[in-house]
């Protein structure tokens, strides 16, 4: 099966790589604009230059294109704890991330919030904190794992998730989240 192509992809596929078909004259292939630039005017004829202009401050294009406008630079979401890793340039969007000892939690495909990595107090680090994953802790005896923090079994009430992790006869309690709550 041939994948369905949109009108723009169909038009582009008629021309060799790096060129696009003139929107008003399908016998002309114009050279695409380099990254960091956008299409100001189509080429007037075969072998003639496309009029490309550099993106203005606050906008970019990251690949060769025939866009009529550059894309707006992304802004890092301060309310999500994001910080700017690298600023926007004409050919690259802003790169946002988290501070040191923080990890990303994605609420949607493109939107993340920064959270502090667990320190595993009253436990040991089983897996170190990573870009998109909190530290995985193993708790010492007498402590249980609650949202990746080791909490004293004295805070464990009967019939709660922690009861099986805080049984007095168990000498070495390993913190594992209750399977019914994930």
């Amino acid at each position: 099966l041939v994948p369905h192509l949109g009108d723009r992809e169909k038009r582009d596929s008629v021309c060799p790589q790096g060129k696009y078909i003139h929107p008003q004259n399908n016998s002309i292939c114009c050279t695409k604009c380099h990254k960091g630039t956008y299409l100001y005017n189509d080429c007037p004829g075969p072998g003639q230059d496309t009029d490309c202009r550099e993106c203005e401050s606050g906008s970019f294009t990251a690949s060769e294109n025939h866009l009529r406008h550059c894309l707006s630079c992304s802004k890092c979401r301060k309310e999500m704890g994001q910080v700017e890793i690298s600023s926007c340039t004409v050919d690259r969007d802003t790169v946002c991330g988290c501070r040191k000892n923080q990890y990303r939690h994605y609420w949607s495909e493109n939107l993340f919030q920064c959270f502090n990595c667990s320190l595993c107090l009253n436990g040991t680090v089983h897996l170190s904190c990573q870009e998109k994953q909190n530290t995985v802790c193993t708790c010492h005896a007498g402590f249980f794992l609650r949202e990746n923090e080791c909490v004293s079994c004295s805070n464990c009430k009967k019939s709660l998730e922690c009861t099986k992790l805080c049984l007095p006869q168990i000498e070495n309690v390993k913190g594992t989240e209750d399977s019914g709550t994930t």
Partner: nanobody, 120 residues
């Protein structure tokens, strides 16, 4: 066993309001980030709003900011979503869910859902 039971959905006109509730049992409610996930017909799941265990931190999707308010009553093991100025695009099944932090977007453990219909 964890149970999350949503209520409060229904038919409302554009511009109207609804308040969703979620009664939680089988988990230590105040320990967890909890939130609301929705699924519109023919679309994927999306996080609408979430709140930390203490209620001190919240998340709202851009599409609902300023219109929806999430809150919780830990003494009643209940999560709420006050939805004002409802729009046609808010129509969906709304699920109460336990947030699992890290990576994502993941939709954790969730209830059976309550249907919100926005129509004139």
């Amino acid at each position: 066993e964890v149970q999350l039971l949503e209520s409060g959905g229904g038919l409302v006109q554009p511009g109207g309001s609804l308040r969703l509730s979620c009664a939680a049992s089988g988990l230590t409610f105040e320990w967890y980030w909890m939130g609301w996930v929705r699924q519109a017909p023919g679309k994927g799941l999306e996080w609408v709003s979430a709140v930390s265990g203490s209620g001190g931190s919240t998340y709202y999707a851009d599409s609902v900011k300023g219109r929806f308010t999430i809150s919780r009553d830990n003494s009643k093991n209940t999560l709420y979503l006050q939805m004002n100025s409802l729009r046609a695009e808010d129509a969906a099944v709304y699920y109460c869910a336990k947030v699992k932090l890290g990576g994502g977007p993941n939709f954790g453990y969730r209830g059976q859902g309550t249907l919100v219909t926005v129509s004139s």
